[in-house]
């Protein structure tokens, strides 16, 4: 058993049929010695008396808010949560496996630049009685500070018969060094509590590996005289790190016909313009990627050819 | 470059960008199912990293690029020695057209651009890393290539910025 926060405790249980459970001793936080009784949740049934209560925790029915009283007055509370371990593996019932970029990806994180700011998000089908708490650091043995805000519900989607809820959190490294080569990864830890179930999820990454620039901005077409060709131009997204002579991007320009089956013409360039042939009913799209490190491409910015 | 002269920024920019391309073709991370099995532990704590105080940021380069260039040179020599060591030359053998050979040559080429014959910056000793099992050697190769990708990305940014703002 360990303390998650004041008066909230997590009991770690091996979860299998007829498992013996864990013996837990609760102590009433009071100078009083006599006349103390214990109850669980809203029930008035007295579970025991005395300054300490010993219970065998085996299942969710044994978890909850234990309260010690004296003469009708509440002395203190202890909330017991359960953390299940099945076949040697901690349960992951609360969050959905996003399976990208690999299996067992419950937390996904992205950064728009090298400033040390990043966003993480996760999915769940649970709509109520759900709380999250996020902590982060750079490195684990001698951790350096990363400050995370509160997790918020950022999107709701309908998937078949189920509703899916997306939560996200923004974090900022306290002393970020955008130009340095990272040697210690960022660690993100999310505590999830649903009713009386506790779970924790972690992710470890280098900012360089989660970079995904915003799409290029101000995408414009300029027809070239007496030609089917057009000059496409664009600019670096506002959110990308500066100076651009140092934090450079590379770009992919794509001409795509109306039909998905039509052949796509692609050009790769380090410049912020390119000359392409604009076909009727086609569209031109441009996306960006770090020029020197193969992290994610941005989403496409698009304009119609006509 | 030792003694404060300016490097051939444009040449260094071109060669460092080529290094980036080669490092990624030697270990294309994207979508490889074995990545999660590489483990999170560092390849080696002795790999030289370009750190915050090494003056490789735009302001540091403007003030005095020598500190940063020396750091990059140390790293290039370190990785050049690693790629030439029995970690890469022993079994399992690489295919003749492996990008590792070109990568090794390009590391040497860029380090010579930074330090012409007759000049000497102190270099870092390479640790004796070679594991006994072939699979351990193979895994170590991929981990070295991953850290090299990060190193050459920073070096390429430095030379691109230098070529754009510090070239005579």
């Amino acid at each position: 058993i360990w303390e998650l926060k004041k008066d909230v405790y997590v009991v770690e249980l091996d979860w299998y049929p007829d498992a013996p459970g864990e013996m837990v001793v609760l102590t009433c936080d009071t100078p009083e010695e006599d006349g103390i009784t214990w109850t669980l949740d809203q029930s008035s049934e007295v579970l025991g008396s005395g300054k300490t209560l010993t219970i065998q925790v085996k299942e969710f029915g044994d978890a909850g808010q234990y309260t010690c009283h004296k003469g009708g007055e509440v002395l203190s509370h202890s909330l017991l949560l359960l953390h299940k371990k099945e076949d040697g593996i901690w349960s992951t019932d609360i969050l959905k496996d996003q399976k990208e970029p690999k299996n067992k990806t419950f937390l996904r994180c992205e950064a728009k630049n090298y400033s040390g700011r990043f966003t993480c998000w996760w999915l769940t089908t649970i709509s109520t009685d759900l709380t999250f708490s996020v902590k982060s650091s750079r490195g684990s043995s001698d951790p350096q500070g990363v400050t995370c805000g509160a997790a918020t519900l950022s999107a709701e989607r309908v998937r078949g018969d189920n509703k899916e809820y997306e939560y996200s959190v923004e974090c900022q490294e306290d002393s970020a060094c955008p130009a340095a080569e990272e040697s210690l990864p960022i660690e993100v830890m999310v505590d999830a509590v649903h009713k009386l179930k506790y779970e924790n999820y972690t992710s470890s990454f280098f900012i360089r590996d989660i970079i995904k620039p915003d799409p290029p901005k101000n995408l414009q077409l300029k027809p070239l005289k007496n030609s089917r060709q057009v000059e496409v131009s664009w600019e670096y997204p506002d959110t990308w790190s500066t100076p651009h002579s140092y934090f450079s991007l590379t770009f992919c320009v794509q001409v795509q016909g109306k039909s998905k089956r039509e052949k796509k013409d692609r050009v790769f360039t380090d410049k912020t313009s390119a000359t392409v042939i604009c076909r009727k009913n086609a569209s031109i799209s441009v996306r960006a990627q770090d020029r020197y490190y193969s992290s994610s491409w941005s989403e496409w910015a698009s304009v119609p050819c006509s | 470059v030792p003694g404060g002269s300016s490097p051939a920024w444009t040449q260094c920019q071109q060669l460092s960008q080529k290094l980036c391309t080669l490092a990624w073709s030697a270990h294309p991370l994207v979508g490889h199912m074995d990545l999660r099995e590489e483990g999170d532990e560092e390849t080696t704590n002795d790999v030289p990293h370009i750190q915050c105080g090494d003056g490789c940021d735009p302001q540091g380069l403007r003030d005095n690029s020598q500190f940063c260039l020396q750091r990059i040179h140390q790293g290039l020599i370190f990785y050049e020695k690693l790629l030439g060591s029995d970690i890469f030359t022993g079994e399992p053998s690489l295919l003749p057209d492996s990008p590792v050979g070109q990568l090794h040559a390009s590391l040497l080429g860029l380090s010579q651009l930074l330090q012409p014959e007759g000049h000497h910056w102190e270099t870092q000793q390479i640790p004796s890393l070679s594991p006994s099992q072939p699979w351990q050697r193979l895994l170590l190769r991929f981990k070295i290539l991953r850290s090299l990708q990060a190193f050459v990305a920073v070096a390429a940014r430095v030379f691109a910025h230098g070529a754009a703002t510090l070239s005579p």
């Epitope: - | 270990h27 199912m33 099995e37 053998s93 295919l95 990008p99 895994l139």
Partner: antibody, heavy 118, light 111 residues
Framework: QVQLQQSDAELVKPGASVKISCKVS????????IHWMKQRPEQGLEWIGY????????KFNEKFKGKATLTADKSSSTAYMQLNSLTSEDSAVYFC???????????WGQGTSVAVSS | DIVLTQSPASLAVSLGQRATISCRAS??????????IHWYQQKPGQPPKFLIY???NLDSGVPARFSGSGSGTDFTLNIHPVEEEDAATYYC?????????FGGGTKLEIK
């Protein structure tokens, strides 16, 4: 030295399920994936799938999805494969093997024979 | 899925002669300087025994009369000079992507 010790032969009825074990020793269980193969009499080898004991997550050959369940118990350094809804087509010898990253299956279990018969 | 086609299905070789087994992949299994093809030997009633990894590298303890070669889609296992104890079925296997697949096997008989 590295060893993979599989459980004994099984004779099971059609429609039943069977759970085969593969106990490893001589290396850190969580370091390498454990793969499972099927071999029918006088036939070649088929790859069923693997489990990575460090995260407990399996990957399957599409053909065996729903047929095989892969688990790993870190405390006993044992990998398990459960085969469900058995038919005569599942009668075979099943092998477990370890695979270091980027490498081959370098150590194999001795095999477990499963016979499905009424 | 990558299909591995082994040929011949069986062959008989005189003691001391060369045995050559071919393994052809339906698409390239080479990338980043390596060919992700491995070879195994299996004798009746036994599990497969690991012989060669990444197309051409011998596992420790495997006799030097075994050798592997090839890249891209065409691979070869050679045994020279063949000995009595080499009578077995030989399988190639790829680990380029999921799902892994094995070749159909080549049964080697010693004359």
């Amino acid at each position: 030295q590295v060893q993979l010790q599989q459980s004994d032969a099984e004779l099971v009825k059609p429609g039943a399920s069977v759970k085969i074990s593969c106990k490893v020793s001589g290396y850190t269980f969580t370091d390498h994936t454990i793969h499972w193969m099927k071999q029918r009499p006088e036939q070649g080898l088929e790859w069923i799938g693997y489990i990575y004991p460090r995260d407990g997550y399996p990957k399957f050959n599409e053909k065996f999805k729903g047929k095989a369940t892969l688990t790993a118990d870190k405390s006993s350094s044992t990998a398990y494969m459960q085969l469900n809804s058995l038919t005569s087509e599942d009668s075979a010898v099943y092998f477990c093997a370890r695979r270091p990253p980027y490498y081959a299956m370098d150590y194999w279990g001795q095999g477990t024979s499963v016979a499905v018969s009424s | 899925d990558i299909v591995l086609t082994q040929s011949p299905a069986s062959l008989a070789v005189s003691l001391g002669q060369r045995a050559t087994i071919s393994c052809r992949a339906s698409k390239s299994v080479s990338t980043s300087g390596y060919s992700y093809i491995h070879w195994y030997q299996q004798k009746p009633g036994q599990p497969p025994k690991f012989l060669i990894y990444l197309a051409s590298n011998l596992d420790s303890g495997v006799p030097a009369r075994f050798s592997g070669s090839g890249s891209g889609t065409d691979f070869t296992l050679n045994i020279h000079p063949v000995e009595e104890e080499d009578a077995a079925t030989y399988y190639c296997q790829h680990s380029r992507e999921l799902p892994y697949t094995f070749g159909g096997g080549t049964k080697l008989e010693i004359k």
